[in-house]
């Protein structure tokens, strides 16, 4: 602060700053005027004794005589562009003249108006009957500022001992409502913005699988409360699980577009059809009222059961070479719909009953022919199976004679002990 200053006789100031009192945002101007002999000095503004380094001030110099050494009138104006609390205080002009410092009489700037909101209630979407908080904060001057909360334009009784609640704790709503707060001080009342609190259905719970099939899942859930608004529908999302599923499970959205199904309610049950057999999925559910959707449930891992292979083994062949028959095939080209557990082989002659054998996972087998009488029209058929059962059988393949150049049976298969090598004792 500038102590070595003079405002007594000999002061050049002929006009001193006045007073301004107003509300936040006010644009005001303080003015001082001085008359000096000789070159006009620069006017500096002080607030509470401290130089305003970045003052928004102007300065006009008007000569009152013919010569620059004659008397000058100097007017300095200080602009307050948007009054705020930090602008309040005592203002003075200061000049240095011939080694002496002069300051004007003080003018005062005060902030006083309707309460000013530092925080206002914000729009929210909350589940029905779920506690939530709203915030509102206001200040003067003048202080004190008291707050009054309104719900749907009706004042709420203040909590005992809390006449100025910054935070309104609400136990929960069953209908969409509006909230605002009024700030009161000696100058009057300011009303905050009106926040709309939208009541959404609660998150559904107990999402579970009722029944599982290879291409179908039946799921059910329990809806959450939805206030006075009946549920209109639920949306179920299903997404194929993959190796990276753990990365996105904690997030709200899966990496690719999920299958979304809308279902009318009640009942709170849904059959998911046309799924892939023996496939892991993740599902979640959200239910909606006229006010909007509930939060999604957490992703629930589910899996369809295995199905049977959709087609028979391919390229089945049966070739005779002396007393041996080599039967070969390839895995079905169509989906197996599960884990391949093995193959079954069936053979029959024109006048003999069908014989079934479990071959396991091998794709060729050597059969030992015994007996002295050939069987007429011998045919062989093969099927693949999963834990769900057998797939379709291949068309019966007749026994072909061995022709040179067709390759030899694989020795390790030929020499395999039973059950890989079988005897037909009636031949």
């Amino acid at each position: 602060a500038h102590k070595d200053t003079q405002t007594e006789a000999g002061s050049p100031f002929v006009g001193n700053p006045g007073n301004i009192t107003g509300a936040r945002g006010l644009t005001g101007t303080l003015r001082c005027e001085l008359q000096v002999q000789g070159e006009p000095p620069e006017v500096v503004w002080l607030r509470d004794g401290q130089i305003l380094e970045l003052a928004d001030n102007t300065q006009t110099q008007v000569p009152l005589g013919e010569d620059w050494q004659d008397e000058w009138k100097v007017v300095s104006q200080l602009r307050i562009s948007a009054l705020q609390l930090s602008d309040a205080g005592e203002y003075q002009c200061m000049v240095h003249l011939e080694g002496r410092t002069f300051v004007s009489q003080p003018g005062f700037v005060g902030l006083e108006g309707l309460p000013y909101f530092l925080e206002e209630p914000e729009d929210k979407a909350v589940p029905a009957n779920t506690p939530f908080n709203l915030s509102c904060q206001a200040q003067g001057p003048p202080e004190p500022v008291t707050l009054l909360w309104l719900q749907d334009a009706v004042p709420l009784a203040p909590v005992t001992g809390h006449s100025s609640q910054h935070s309104l704790q609400t136990p929960g709503l069953n209908k969409t409502s509006s909230f605002s707060c009024e700030a009161h001080n000696a100058k009057g009342v300011t009303t905050s913005r009106t926040a709309t609190i939208t009541v959404l259905p609660q998150r559904p719970h107990h999402l579970h699988v009722v029944s599982r099939q290879p291409t179908e899942l039946e799921v059910a859930w329990t809806p959450g409360l939805s206030g006075i608004y009946p549920l209109t529908h639920c949306n179920l999302q299903a997404v194929l699980s993959d190796d990276g599923v753990g990365i996105w499970l904690g997030k709200s959205d899966p990496p690719e577009d999920p299958l979304t199904l809308q279902v009318s309610v009640p009942p709170h049950q849904l059959r998911l059809e046309k799924l892939l057999p023996h496939t892991p999925y993740h599902i979640r559910i959200s239910c909606s009222s006229s006010q909007g959707p509930s939060p999604w449930t957490h992703w629930l891992p589910v899996e369809t059961t295995e199905g049977v292979p959709l087609g028979p083994p391919e390229n089945v062949s049966a070739m005779r070479n002396g007393s041996q028959v080599l039967v070969r095939w390839q895995e079905p080209r169509v989906p197996l719909q599960g884990t391949l557990l093995g193959y079954r082989l069936a053979y029959r002659g024109q006048d003999t009953p069908e014989v079934l054998m479990d071959i396991g996972l091998t794709r060729e087998v050597t059969l030992e022919l015994r007996g002295d009488r050939p069987v007429a029209n011998l045919t062989v058929s093969v099927t693949a199976y999963t834990s769900a059962g057998d797939g379709p059988w291949s068309l019966p393949v007749p026994l072909e004679p061995w022709r040179p150049g067709q390759g030899q049976p694989l020795h390790h298969l030929v020499s395999e002990p039973p059950p890989r090598a079988f005897s037909w004792p009636w031949w």
């Epitope: 006009g15 945002g25 006010l26 644009t27 101007t29 003052a55 001030n57 102007t58 300065q59 104006q77």
Partner: antibody
Framework: EVQLVESGGGLVQPGGSLRLSCAAS????????IHWVRQAPGKGLEWVGW????????YYADSVKGRFTISADTSKNTAYLQMNSLRAEDTAVYYC??????????????????WGQGTLV | DIQMTQSPSSLSASVGDRVTITCRAS??????VAWYQQKPGKAPKLLIY???FLYSGVPSRFSGSGSGTDFTLTISSLQPEDFATYYC?????????FGQGTKVEIK
């Protein structure tokens, strides 16, 4: 005699630039705030911004912030409005005006007592 | 921003009539209101500042009043040269804003 004279208006393509000048005489720019105000054809008045020529501080309307720049050269007693990234909605007559805030030790608000003749952009 | 709403938007009057134009601010602007007169093709001219102070050189038939949110410009006896458009302007907060104008026409 106090006078303000604008110049520099003209036809410009959207996205283009233009610089308007406001030459003051009869008073010193250093002693007052200078405002720019515009008026679209057949419409009302819209404040564009102000400058304190003594300090060089400027203040702008949201509609022009970042595109327009107000400056002043006190040695030439002239204020300028540099307009960049012009849009069709900037079409208007542009006025410069001197602020009058009354006398006495203080005042709230201000008025504009001397206006230029305007220049059409 | 503070809105300034002028009424009427236009009026017809005869020479010698008393004319009143009102301006309403969307919030309290104290007395930080000015009134301007504008004729076609010309720049606005200051008539009234600080709500009620007559600017130097303006005829005394013009007067202004009001404080807070409601302001009035009165022409006590309309003269031929007064047919023009009149604007109010608030400068209590930045940005300063103008009313939409009132056109005074000859009846």
């Amino acid at each position: 005699e106090v006078q303000l004279v604008e110049s520099g208006g003209g036809l410009v393509q959207p996205g283009g630039s233009l610089r308007l000048s406001c030459a003051a005489s009869g008073f010193s720019l250093s002693g007052s705030w200078i405002h720019w105000v515009r008026q679209a054809p057949g419409k009302g008045l819209e404040w564009v911004g102000w400058i304190n020529p003594y300090r060089g501080y400027a203040y702008y309307a949201d509609s022009v912030k970042g595109r327009f720049t107000i400056s002043a050269d006190t040695s030439k007693n002239t204020a300028y409005l540099q307009m960049n990234s012009l849009r069709a909605e900037d079409t208007a007559v542009y006025y410069c005006a001197r602020e009058y805030s009354g006398w006495g030790g203080s005042s709230v608000g201000y008025a504009m007592d001397y206006w230029g003749q305007g220049t059409l952009v | 921003d503070i809105q300034m709403t002028q009424s009427p938007s236009s009026l017809s009057a005869s020479v010698g009539d008393r004319v009143t134009i009102t301006c309403r601010a969307s919030q309290d602007v104290s007395t930080a209101v000015a009134w301007y007169q504008q004729k076609p093709g010309k720049a606005p001219k200051l008539l009234i500042y600080s709500a009620s102070f007559l600017y130097s050189g303006v005829p005394s038939r013009f007067s202004g009043s009001g404080s807070g949110t409601d302001f009035t410009l009165t022409i006590s006896s309309l003269q031929p040269e007064d047919f023009a458009t009149y604007y109010c302007q608030q400068s209590y907060t930045t940005p300063p804003t103008f009313g939409q104008g009132t056109k005074v026409e000859i009846k």
